[in-house]
Interface confidence: medium
């Protein structure tokens, strides 16, 4: 599998409509929770929680502050922590409790605390519960949590130093935790947790499962340096711990290695960055997408692998276990366990079969089973990705977060659209197209190029957004910028499953925003723009420049995958000519203008889509070079130099169908603009008064010109 190409389009922050939320002096907007029923987005930041309108996040509905007392700050600082940054309250848990309350935990100056937030009054209830094991002490430490039926499942560190990792369930009737032992958790960096509900029609009375994803230091691979391993672990929701062995500890904790590698090149992605569980009506079993980087990432590599949850469950239900053996110098080595496995199966959830054998709860499990799972929490079998390869590998980028949306194109094909954020504040939107990856676009969400810390996807039909949180604020972006594609060709070439061309309105529209039927809309995910209707008319610009000056003709081709070249009077302009240059890889510069430069200039783009080359006329300019006589200037009139010696521009209607390009031209290359010749020295005619238009009366003529099409595609 090749590296993913560059994004086809790059939207700068100011180019597209992005809605922002940030409050003065509030930072670290890293916890996001969406209530789609209420159209409210809850935001947990440093020392504050906000409720904003999910349809327009710049509209703040409520705010509440949870600050650390000066006394607590001082105590924290005494322990060697920074009073200005670390000894504050970073909201790390923001989970739903009921329609009117949230469960909120914060680092609270290295004394983690939790409270209930009443959503009606938007005030904390002042419960001030101990947050140990639910929330990290240190804002820099990893954490994850999920609320399942009123009980908080967390992965974090249990002490001030962050040296004791824990996966726990905070429950009034059955609190549970992991063993504090290296085989269970070895310096984990927690990434994500979620509950997977049993299927309603499941015949074997199986239990809901809570999955945890993290990277930890390997126990099974030994090298000179510490090898990191991405893990998937799971516990059963019905687990109540053991009666004697594993009392108040998980009896169902099992973990396995996640594989994400490129077999042909030996590229192994072993640091897990983020996980997204894709649930869709069309999916019998959820698919989870995991985002990785390699351990030694000096080149900026990132990969996305997708996994069927059933593959993971198969490993836990039927896979082999690993066991530690002591070799010379009391050195521990982990190998596959081939001995007998006790019954009921260690780590298994209590199902109908177990109940039939009178094991109605984990409290009834025999010591043999419990002792085995205590000593063998690691599976020997690994969880392999769908198609045994990554969905996407990208170099020169560090991806930070991922969300995925399953959507249907006009032809009925289903696409998993990956929205992946970067450590430079951008969002990439990518799909798999016939075993290749197409990065539809890159959007610069944050102007300051800061890392995206959290991503959230709304699933409400009609109003679909991605929300991104960073240190400085939250940004709301639509799933697609269809309206920015001005022509049918642009709309089709975007190969965006959310967008289609509407011939009646001559606009690129978002498919799922409208309830109206999709009849007559044009979408071609192959990028075949020949499906677009012929355009008999389009605009071109008419410019008047003066003799000896320099003209800049604009060409706004947004595609990064397109090569731009220019034609003059249907001949392709040569790159070598000292007469021409390219500005910003697209705009044409014509130096030392003379009457011979008057005529029609066309900017064409050439884009390879699959095995076809698509040519488009992006812009047409009619240039007229005038010899402007020196006017008689009244003494009071101010005289200015007009940049580029331009006289005027007007827009007229013309055909914009392309003609086939022959040989190489003045064209943009990946290396950037062509070197420009020096600007010609100003001549006497380059000093023009502002009233120069009055000296060229024909500028006011209302002539409409049509340019003949010479399209022979």
């Amino acid at each position: 599998m090749a590296f993913a190409p560059i994004p086809r389009i790059t939207w700068e922050h100011r180019e597209v409509h992005l809605v922002q939320f940030h409050e003065p002096d509030i930072y670290n907007y890293s916890a996001l929770l969406l209530s789609e029923d209420k159209d409210t987005l809850y935001i947990g930041a440093r020392e504050a929680v906000f409720a904003v309108n999910a349809l327009n996040i710049s509209e703040k509905q409520h705010e509440v502050y949870w600050k650390v007392s000066e006394d607590k700050k001082a105590k924290c600082a005494e322990k060697g922590k920074s009073k200005q940054t670390e000894c504050l309250n970073y909201i790390r848990v923001l989970q739903p409790l009921s329609a009117t309350s949230l469960y909120v935990c914060g680092t609270n100056a290295f004394q983690p605390a939790c409270d209930h937030l009443n959503l009606t009054s938007f005030k904390f209830l002042g419960k001030n519960e101990d947050g140990k094991g639910r929330c990290p002490f240190d804002p820099a430490h990893s954490y994850t949590s999920v609320m399942v039926d009123g009980e908080l499942y967390s992965g974090t560190s249990y002490n001030f130093l962050g040296s004791e990792p824990i996966i726990s369930r905070n429950s009034s009737h059955s609190p549970l935790r992991t063993e504090y032992a290296i085989p269970w958790l070895n310096e984990p960096s927690f990434v994500f947790a979620d509950v997977i509900r049993k299927s309603p029609d499941s015949p074997d009375g199986e239990d809901d499962r809570v999955y945890f994803f993290f990277t930890e230091v390997s126990v099974e691979y030994e090298f000179v340096f510490r090898v990191l391993i991405p893990r998937i672990a799971r516990v059963c929701k019905g687990d109540q711990g053991g009666l004697r062995t594993l009392q108040k500890k998980w009896t169902s904790f099992l973990k396995a290695r996640l594989i994400c590698s490129r077999p042909d090149s030996g590229l192994v992605f072993n640091v897990l960055r983020d996980v997204f569980v894709l649930r869709s009506p069309g999916l019998k079993v959820p698919v989870f997408y995991a985002l990785f980087t390699p351990q030694l990432n000096n080149v900026g590599l990132s990969a996305v692998c997708a996994y069927n949850l059933s593959t993971a469950e198969e490993v836990f239900s039927h896979g082999k276990y690993m066991q530690s053996t002591t070799v010379e110098q009391s050195h521990t080595k982990w190998v596959r366990y081939n001995g007998p496995v006790p019954k009921p199966r260690p780590g298994a959830c209590i199902d109908s079969e177990a109940r039939a054998a009178n094991y109605t709860s984990s409290l009834n499990l025999p010591d043999k089973t419990l002792q085995f799972v205590k000593d063998h929490p690691l599976m020997d079998d690994s969880v392999t990705p769908i198609d045994n390869r990554p969905r996407l590998i990208k170099k020169d980028v560090n991806y930070t977060q991922i969300v995925v949306d399953r959507t249907q194109a006009l032809d009925g094909t289903v696409y998993d659209v990956m929205f992946v954020s970067t450590d430079r504040g951008a969002l990439h939107k990518a799909i798999s197209l016939e075993h290749a990856v197409h990065i539809i676009e890159e959007t610069q969400l944050f102007q300051d190029f800061e890392p995206v810390q959290t991503l959230l996807l709304s699933s409400k039909k009609g109003n679909r957004f991605v929300y991104a949180g960073s240190n400085s604020g939250v940004v709301q972006a639509p799933l697609a910028f269809c309206g920015k594609h001005g022509t049918c060709e642009d709309c089709v070439l975007a190969r965006d499953p959310y967008c289609a061309w509407s011939p009646p309105t001559a606009t690129c529209v978002a498919l799922h925003q409208t309830e109206s039927p999709s009849r007559g809309l044009i979408q071609e995910m192959s990028g075949d723009a020949s499906v677009c209707p012929d355009k008999s008319k389009g605009s071109y610009r008419q410019h008047f420049f003066k003799h000896g000056g320099t003209a800049e003709l604009k060409c706004s081709q947004k595609s990064n995958l397109a090569r731009v070249f220019w034609k003059f009077q249907n001949g392709v302009l040569k790159a070598e000519s000292p007469k021409y240059g390219l500005m910003g890889r697209k705009n044409l510069l014509i130096f030392n203008l003379s009457e011979g430069d008057s005529g029609v200039y066309q900017c064409l783009s050439e884009e390879r889509v699959k095995n076809k080359t698509v040519f488009q006329v992006v812009a047409k300019h009619v240039l007229e070079v005038k010899v402007v006589p020196k006017p008689v200037v009244a003494p009071t009139l101010s005289v200015v130099q007009t940049e580029g010696s331009r006289i005027a521009t007007k827009v007229l209607v013309a055909s914009t169908q392309g003609s086939s390009p022959p040989t190489p031209a003045v064209q943009a290359t990946s290396s950037g603009a062509i070197t420009l010749p020096p600007k010609p020295a100003p001549t006497g005619t380059s000093c023009e008064p502002k009233i120069v238009i009055n000296t060229v009366p024909q500028l006011h003529s209302e002539k409409t010109m049509y340019l003949k099409s010479s399209d022979n595609r």
């Epitope: 029923d37 159209d39 039926d149 199986e206 039909k461």
Partner: antibody, heavy 122, light 106 residues
Framework: DVKLVESGEDLVKPGGSLKVSCAAS????????MSWVRQTPEKRLEWVAY????????YYADSVKGRFTISRDNARNTLYLQMTSLRSEDTAMYFC???????????????WGQGTSLTVSS | DIVMTQSHKFMSASVGDRVSITCKAS??????VAWYQQKPGQSPKLLIY???TRHTGVPDRFTGSGSGTDFTLTINNVQSEDLADYFC????????FGGGTKLEIK
Amino acid sequence: DVKLVESGEDLVKPGGSLKVSCAASGFTFRDYAMSWVRQTPEKRLEWVAYISSGGDYIYYADSVKGRFTISRDNARNTLYLQMTSLRSEDTAMYFCTRDPSFYGRGYYFDYWGQGTSLTVSS
Amino acid sequence: DIVMTQSHKFMSASVGDRVSITCKASQDVGATVAWYQQKPGQSPKLLIYWASTRHTGVPDRFTGSGSGTDFTLTINNVQSEDLADYFCQQYSNYPTFGGGTKLEIK
């Protein structure tokens, strides 16, 4: 104080139709998912239908699917149940209930109306 | 559908007694169980949700326990006003109710 008040009782012939309503007060109606639950003359409770706070998500019990329609008017703080093709087994006390879970779809009910009695008989 | 079975249709207790009403689910429902009290001529009232969490205003004489398939509602120090029908309900899937247990006061 949370109050749910259903419309008056009725006697309907089999095959007939009826629309019952529930007026909510004492809480922000638009923030809560709502359900209809019925109780048969034998005192058996049966969940009938669910609607999310914004009205985007609607679910029905198999026994009423295709015959009953749940709807809400958040501006009027009112929940409705339109019942058609009524059968004798639909005879019950119909309760309007509130679902207090964060995401809705919690399907447990923290407040119940006083109920409206429906008798389907010829 | 998940079937909720309350094996005792009737139970009787004297004032001050402790009584345990049981409910069994046909499959594992985790902790997604609620208990309701319905006094004669009234609509049901929520007592317990998430198997063991008391609803606002419910006296602490009422306690819920259990998880998976077996659930119990315990009433300590039974009072005369506790005369009522008690229903369990699962909400792991579309909600279903138990048949009810009538508590009579001797």
